[in-house]
Interface confidence: low
């Protein structure tokens, strides 16, 4: 499995690096955070792409002022956006 | 909280077969690959076999000291791996370890590990 | 198969003291390297992944580097609960662990 990797990029400009993944990968990870106050204000945003050994949570997270979401694929280089 | 808990163990014959079952829970077992490791009476640690999840066919991988004896199982309905051991021989005894890695911290660790269940194998 | 040559294979030191042991892999395994620990009669603990990464709630003291065929792990400030057998592990390519360091409490 291939899959883009960065960490904590703010833009997915930056998170065009194509990986080789351990034979333990599964999974390409694509987790978005961002923080603010509901849909008004956003205080900050960063992209991460990693090789997983499994799809961390299923579905997006939100936690106070912050949310997460984590979308997870299973072909090469399917973490692209 | 994560927990694996293995079960099956016992006094077999050489050349016998016996299979040893883990049960997990706590976390999304679907999702994660599998191991079993074991550690013979006072000697070190040794891992033996893995298996790896559905979306990539199962696939199994062994130490070549068990290759072609033992055979690693999964049931995803039920949250167990399974070790059936087949031909055993009196090295073979050992205390046999179920373990996971924790995939929320992304590593691929061993980071949860079952109590270990005893695998005696004399004539 | 890759071999973990691991060393010392027992240590007596005292409390406070700093331990340090090492792992050498026969071939490259990158930073694939974990540490574990092992108390009498328990199941194994995962202290250090990826060479040199602190496990959740391992505590400060437990710490690992190198890359390639060289790692070392320290226990700086040595405490009488780390009484226990540690162990290299790599991961590069299947996995295989050291033979184990024995510490004890002098």
């Known amino acids: 499995l291939m899959c883009f990797s960065c960490l904590n990029q703010k833009s997915n400009l930056y998170c065009l690096k194509p990986t080789i993944c351990s034979d333990q990968d599964n999974y390409c990870v694509t987790v978005s955070a961002s923080a603010g106050i509901g849909n008004l204000v956003t205080f900050g945003h960063s992209l991460s792409k990693t090789c997983s050994p499994a799809c961390p949570i299923p579905e997006g997270v939100n936690v106070g002022v912050a949310s997460m979401g984590i979308s997870c694929c299973q072909s090469f280089l399917c973490n692209f956006s | 909280a994560v927990q694996l808990v293995e079960f099956g163990g016992g006094l077999v014959q050489p050349k016998e077969s016996l299979k040893i079952s883990c049960a997990a829970s706590g976390f999304t077992f679907s999702t994660v690959a599998m191991h079993w490791v074991r550690q013979a009476p006072g000697k070190g640690l040794e891992w033996i076999a893995r298996?790896?999840?559905?979306?990539?066919?199962?696939?199994?991988y062994y130490a070549d000291s068990v290759k072609g004896r033992f055979t690693i199982s999964r049931d995803d309905s039920k949250s167990m791996v399974y070790l059936q051991m087949d031909n055993l021989k009196t090295e073979d005894a050992a205390m046999y370890y179920c373990?996971?890695?924790?995939?929320?911290?992304?590593?691929?660790?061993?980071?949860?590990w079952g109590q270990g269940t005893l695998v005696t194998v004399s004539s | 198969d890759i071999v973990m040559t691991q060393s010392p294979t027992s240590i007596s030191i005292s409390v406070g003291e700093r331990v340090t042991m090492n792992c050498k892999a026969s071939q490259n395994v990158g930073s694939n390297v974990d540490w574990y620990q092992q108390k009498t009669g328990q199941s194994p603990e995962l202290l250090i992944y990826k060479a040199s990464n602190r496990y959740t709630g391992v505590p400060g003291r437990f710490t690992g580097s190198g890359s390639g065929t060289d790692f070392t792990f320290t226990i700086s400030n040595l405490q009488a609960e780390d009484l226990a057998v540690y162990y290299c592990m790599q991961s590069d390519t299947k996995y295989t662990f050291g033979a184990g360091t024995k510490v004890e409490i002098k």
């Open positions: 373990s996971a890695p924790n995939y929320y911290d992304g590593t691929y660790s061993f980071a949860y």
């Open positions: 298996i790896r999840t559905k979306p990539v066919n199962y696939e199994t």
